[in-house]
């Protein structure tokens, strides 16, 4: 018995269906086929869980969280023992193993390993201003999404016809910050932060109002 090499990893957007491949070749009839799918969750590597089991011509549910979401892609018994997982959740991310036995066929590699990564688009980011908005001050524009896998990058733009940040601004696309030094009236206006990753984007807008000192009455 020999389990074929798997592609290594599968990526899927949260809520979509993941197909985890596993196929084998055997010299024996599929009368005593036994297939166990296990997962080592990324969030808890010390707690492997059973995903689904095929034994004695019957299918059995694995861990409770997979109930109603998992099944074999084809009619069993078969040499293709790939599974699907519907409505994928972040907690489904992990290393999946298919363990195949088909007595009396022994020897060979009977385990296939596939990684599953559930991707999450950036959630609506929060735009905030840190620091005094008084003329001549330094301010930091902050942007961050609570969710996003892979981790989002952040791009700030000023929503005027140049789409450029003020000349005194420096941007950190990883942290999601823009530092504007010595703010002037020209720094005032509407700024857009775009949070983006491999599967999506999300934005927030920020209104920067530079406060000019009131002329003192004599």
């Amino acid at each position: 018995l020999e389990v074929s090499e798997s592609p290594g990893s599968v990526q899927v957007a949260r809520g979509q269906t993941a197909v985890l491949p596993c196929a084998f070749s055997t010299s024996a009839a599929l009368l005593n086929l036994n297939v166990i799918w296990m997962v080592i969750p990324l969030s808890n590597a010390n707690q492997p869980e059973q995903v689904i089991l095929y034994q004695g011509g019957q299918m059995f549910d694995g861990a409770l969280r997979f109930h109603g979401r998992v099944g074999f892609t084809g009619t069993m018994p078969a040499t293709n023992v790939s599974i699907f997982i519907n409505n994928t959740q972040l907690s489904d991310t992990g290393t999946y193993q298919c363990l195949v036995n088909n007595l009396p066929d022994r020897g060979g590699r009977n385990i296939g390993v596939t990684g599953l990564t559930v991707l999450v688009p950036p959630s609506a980011p929060q735009c905030q201003i840190q620091g005094s908005q008084d003329l001549g001050s330094d301010v930091i524009l902050l942007c961050s999404s609570e969710e996003g896998i892979p981790r989002p990058t952040y791009l700030w733009e000023k929503l005027d016809n140049t789409l450029k940040l003020p000349p005194t601004a420096t941007q950190d696309q990883v942290q999601g910050t823009v530092t504007i030094r010595n703010i002037s009236a020209l720094s005032s206006g509407l700024y857009q932060c775009v949070a983006s990753n491999a599967i999506g984007t999300s934005t927030c807008l920020l209104d920067l109002q530079v406060i000019s000192p009131q002329p003192r009455s004599v």
């Epitope: 688009p121 950036p122 609506a124 735009c127 733009e157 929503l159 005027d160 016809n161 789409l163 009236a185 020209l186 005032s188 206006g189 509407l190 857009q192 775009v194 999506g200 984007t201 999300s202 934005t203 927030c204 807008l205 920020l206 209104d207 109002q209």
Partner: antibody, heavy 123, light 110 residues
Framework: QVQLQESGPGLVKPSQTLSLTCTVS??????????WSWIRQHPGKGLEWIGY???????YYNPSLKSRVTISVDTSKNQFSLKLSSVTAADTAVYYC???????????????WGQGTLVTVSS | QSVLTQPPSASGTPGQRVTISCSGS????????VNWYQQLPGTAPKLLIS???NRPSGVPDRFSGSKSGTSASLAITGLQAEDEADYYC???????????FGGGTKLTVL
């Protein structure tokens, strides 16, 4: 409560420049946080955002119209204006001025709006 | 062609509940908030619902908004004759870096 009122010619010849003015009353156009906008509505169709101006003079235009649009502000008169060059029959529409503000939102809204003025492009 | 898609017309009888849908994409409704405007005959649009589901002061609680995925909807319960108007959805589009509207839905009260 801020009110807006559009004014300008209702008929413009093709290839000429459409010019409209919006007068703001009940508040100052120089109030921070308000972006003075133009929006148009083609006959029997949806709305299209044209662009905005901030009291400082900073402008931002719809990329699809950017090459033909100029928005300006006159804070002393509490007015802002729209110029749309090289007009064709496709620019026939009701033109609205509106105030956009962010409020506590992530993306803001348009409120209030002027009554709108119909501009027909025809020879 | 409007960026956001609305049905051109909707209708209902007084007292009924009607919903108006607004369909967009991941770059607008999918990732940004939605506003709704009411345009009574011969008047300018008026803000009806802001930020997906917030009613500005003065808007009756018969009007409500919701958003799911890349679609939004406006619900009107206890339909009244004065609700006969055009309704527009609006969102911000991250790809266009600008504000986009639906084509409008004409609501008729039968």
């Amino acid at each position: 409560q801020v009110q807006l009122q559009e004014s300008g010619p209702g008929l413009v010849k093709p290839s000429q420049t459409l010019s409209l003015t919006c007068t703001v009353s009940g508040g100052s156009i120089s109030s921070g946080g308000y972006y003075w906008s133009w929006i148009r509505q083609h006959p029997g169709k949806g709305l299209e955002w044209i662009g905005y101006i901030y009291y400082s003079g900073s402008t931002y235009y719809n990329p699809s119209l950017k090459s033909r649009v100029t928005i300006s502000v006159d804070t002393s008169k509490n007015q802002f204006s729209l110029k749309l060059s090289s007009v064709t029959a496709a620019d026939t529409a009701v033109y609205y001025c509106a105030s956009w503000s962010l409020g506590t939102s992530n993306h803001g809204w348009f409120d209030p709006w002027g009554q709108g003025t119909l501009v027909t492009v025809s020879s | 062609q409007s960026v956001l898609t609305q049905p051109p017309s909707a209708s209902g009888t007084p007292g009924q509940r009607v919903t108006i849908s607004c369909s967009g994409s991941s770059s607008n409704i999918g990732s940004n908030t939605v506003n709704w405007y009411q345009q009574l005959p011969g008047t300018a649009p008026k803000l009806l619902i802001s930020d997906n589901n917030n009613r500005p002061s003065g808007v009756p609680d018969r009007f409500s908004g919701s958003k799911s995925g890349t679609s939004a909807s406006l619900a009107i319960t206890g339909l009244q004759a004065e609700d006969e108007a055009d309704y527009y959805c609006q969102s911000y589009d991250s790809n266009l870096s600008g504000w986009v509207f639906g084509g409008g839905t004409k609501l008729t009260v039968l």
